[in-house]
Amino acid sequence: MMTGTIETTGNISAEKGGSIILQCHLSSTTAQVTQVNWEQQDQLLAICNADLGWHISPSFKDRVAPGPGLGLTLQSLTVNDTGEYFCIYHTYPDGTYTGRIFLEVLESSVAEHGARFQIP
């Protein structure tokens, strides 16, 4: 039975040219996390595998940084980065948990996001 829940940063916004941390946290389960995939719509950004380390999709390699932890740092943001992001947790023995984050990249300096996940 899957008892876990995914906590995410929810809806966040950031400035064009800036950086943002995408973060999910799996709680309420003792299941072992074997792999976390980060996807934007159907596009793979990165994979963090417990045994193999990080795989960053070649098209994002220059502006996606692994971490912190199982999170993902997006750099040099553009308005095209606006959209839904998904963290997909493969766990044993529970199975798969999915979390959703909506990122809005703003042109001006009106972007506000939680300080806990912001890169100065």
């Epitope: 074997t34 792999q35 793979l44 994979i47 595998n49 417990a50 045994d51 193999l52 380390g53 795989h55 960053i56 999709s57 070649p58 098209s59 390699k61 220059d62 493969h90 044993y92 798969t96």
Partner: antibody, heavy 119, light 107 residues
Framework: EVQLQQSGPELVKPGASMKMSCKAS????????MHWVKQKPGQGLEWIGY????????KYNEKFKGKATLTSDKSSSIAYMELSSLTSEDSAVFYC????????????WGAGTTVTVSS | DIQMTQSPASLSASVGETVTFTCRTN??????LTWYQQKQGKSPQVLVY???TLAEGVPSRFSGSGSGTQFSLKINSLQPEDFGSYFC?????????FGAGTKLELK
């Protein structure tokens, strides 16, 4: 066209070390990891490990730790594998293979380097 | 280590026939499975990755299916160039491992 050009065959003596190369062309070298795979004559495939030229990070199959050392040179787009303390068990074809864009599979392979260990 | 079991070990078929290879794992690997073709004296070539995604340039007569622990590769209407060995490989943990292969021969 994406190509991986591997160095030529090697005849080496037991106990010696050797280093083979894999020159990449037709793509941005630092955007993809490079894997190495062993195949003994008429047998299956064994993954040795990978090197990420972007940050020089590497991961090894536990079986090949201490046997294989993976390095790369960004400036020349060449990946290297050094094999040490060679024995007849190391006689095989060794392939370099580019990592796939969606994970740890192999989307382009070199032609292979044949290593023969014999006295 | 994740064990990969391929069957059959060898298979004889004729041009125009349809064949199916299977690959079984001893633990759940979701859809993280790749199929390769290797001809005698040549390097392997990727056919299908993530269990069902056809690699670039691979003819549509090839198709992959399955998830979890059971996977298959199907070739419709065999062509002369399809004869050779086929390997599966998981990409869900260290070490990455391959099946022992299926040798497809001309009947």
């Amino acid at each position: 066209e994406v190509q991986l050009q591997q160095s030529g065959p090697e005849l080496v003596k037991p106990g010696a070390s050797m280093k083979m190369s894999c020159k990449a062309s037709g793509y941005k070298f630092t955007s993809y990891v490079m894997h190495w795979v062993k195949q003994k004559p008429g047998q299956g495939l064994e993954w040795i490990g990978y090197i990420d030229p972007y940050n020089d990070g590497s991961k090894y199959n536990e079986k090949f730790k201490g046997k294989a050392t993976l390095t790369s040179d960004k400036s020349s787009s060449i990946a290297y594998m050094e094999l040490s303390s060679l024995t007849s068990e190391d006689s095989a074809v060794f392939y370099c293979a580019r990592g796939g864009s969606r994970g740890w599979y192999f989307d382009v392979w070199g032609a292979g380097t044949t290593v023969t260990v014999s006295s | 280590d994740i064990q990969m079991t391929q069957s059959p070990a060898s298979l004889s078929a004729s041009v125009g026939e349809t064949v199916t290879f299977t690959c079984r794992t001893n633990e759940n690997i979701y859809s993280y499975l790749t199929w390769y073709q290797q001809k005698q004296g040549k390097s392997p070539q990727v056919l299908v990755y993530n269990a069902k995604t056809l690699a670039e340039g691979v003819p549509s007569r090839f198709s992959g299916s399955g998830s979890g622990t059971q996977f298959s590769l199907k070739i419709n209407s065999l062509q002369p160039e399809d004869f050779g060995s086929y390997f599966c490989q998981h990409h869900f943990g260290n070490p990455l491992t391959f099946g022992a292969g299926t040798k497809l021969e001309l009947k």
